[in-house]
């Protein structure tokens, strides 16, 4: 999960394997200040896991987030 | 080093249920997500479900649906998968493997469980 | 469902490269993860995200991914080498491992 300083949610690592694309419902970027570039994925349970944005999976459920 | 060690073999009549066991040891079950694998003799693997831990779900492969559980026991970092209405095609070997955080794709396995159904 | 497409099998003389490819529609989009299966035993992770490999997995082993397929390449091939070979994906148009049909790769 990312963590939030000064209300800024930075995450510190990655989850390595994709997620179920039917689990997720949202992701938003974490800010430039965070030092490690992030995609965070929130789930249909209202959890939030941190993604590299440069993994092949989490651009594709980007793509497939943004068309639907 | 994770080792996962599964119970033994079974041999089933049509119609029954089978439960195959996979206990983790070196890490805590919580530490990963653990997938079934099935391989008939002589045929390839096949994918069967799994669990995600990011989400507290329980993903299965459709063909399975409705016919497989998979369950956990943290307390004894054991998982469990349950295959019911048993017929002679799911006569196979049956594999646990984890899915760790990292690196991606499912390493290591257990040493498979070999069912059998027949009447 | 996604469907991966393997070779049954693969001859090659030790000491030379052993390639074998899986095959999918726009597999180059997908990372692709490969295991070996020796006779009798469980399979074991040999390349992931198309070109990655686990500690202990020798350099000899190494993987590519273009277009609509992904190769993994057995380099100064041993007789330990031969076994049945797996290429796997997410599908996430289903939520599914798929894993291709299996390679048998024999050394002569």
């Known amino acids: 999960s990312p963590y939030s300083s000064d209300t800024t949610p930075c995450c510190f690592a990655y989850i390595a394997r994709p997620l179920p694309r039917a689990h997720i419902k949202e992701y938003f970027y974490t800010s430039g200040k965070c030092s490690n570039p992030a995609v965070v994925f929130v789930t249909r349970k209202n959890r939030q896991v941190c993604a590299n944005p440069e993994k092949k999976w989490v651009r594709e459920y980007i793509n497939s987030l943004e068309m639907s | 080093q994770v080792q996962l060690v599964q119970s033994g073999a079974e041999v089933k009549k049509p119609g029954a249920s089978v439960k195959v066991s996979c206990k983790v040891s070196g890490y805590t079950l919580n530490d990963f997500a653990m997938h079934w694998v099935r391989q008939a003799p002589g045929k390839g693997l096949e994918w069967m479900g799994g669990?995600?831990?990011?989400?507290?779900?329980?993903i299965y492969a459709q063909k399975f649906q409705g016919r497989v559980t998979m369950t956990e026991d943290t307390s004894t970092d054991t998982a469990y998968m349950e295959l019911s209405s048993l017929r002679s095609e799911d006569t196979a070997v049956y594999y646990c493997a984890t899915d760790p955080l990292y690196p991606p794709g499912l390493s290591p396995w257990g040493q498979g469980t070999t069912v059998t159904v027949s009447s | 469902s996604y469907v991966l497409t393997q070779p049954p099998s693969v001859s090659v003389a030790p000491g030379q490269t052993a390639r074998i490819t899986c095959g999918g529609n726009n597999i180059e989009s997908k990372s692709v993860h490969w295991y070996q299966q020796k006779p009798g035993q469980a399979p074991v992770l040999v390349v992931y995200?198309?070109?990655d490999r686990p500690s202990g997995i020798p350099e000899r082993f190494s993987g590519s991914n273009s277009g609509n397929t992904a190769t993994l390449t057995i380099s100064r091939v041993e007789a330990g080498d031969e076994a049945d070979y797996y290429c796997?994906?997410?599908?996430?148009?289903?939520?599914?491992?798929?894993f291709g049909g299996g390679t048998k790769v024999t050394v002569l």
């Open positions: 796997q994906v997410w599908d996430s148009n289903t939520d599914h491992w798929v």
């Open positions: 669990y995600v831990p990011e989400d507290g779900d329980t």
């Open positions: 995200d198309d070109s």
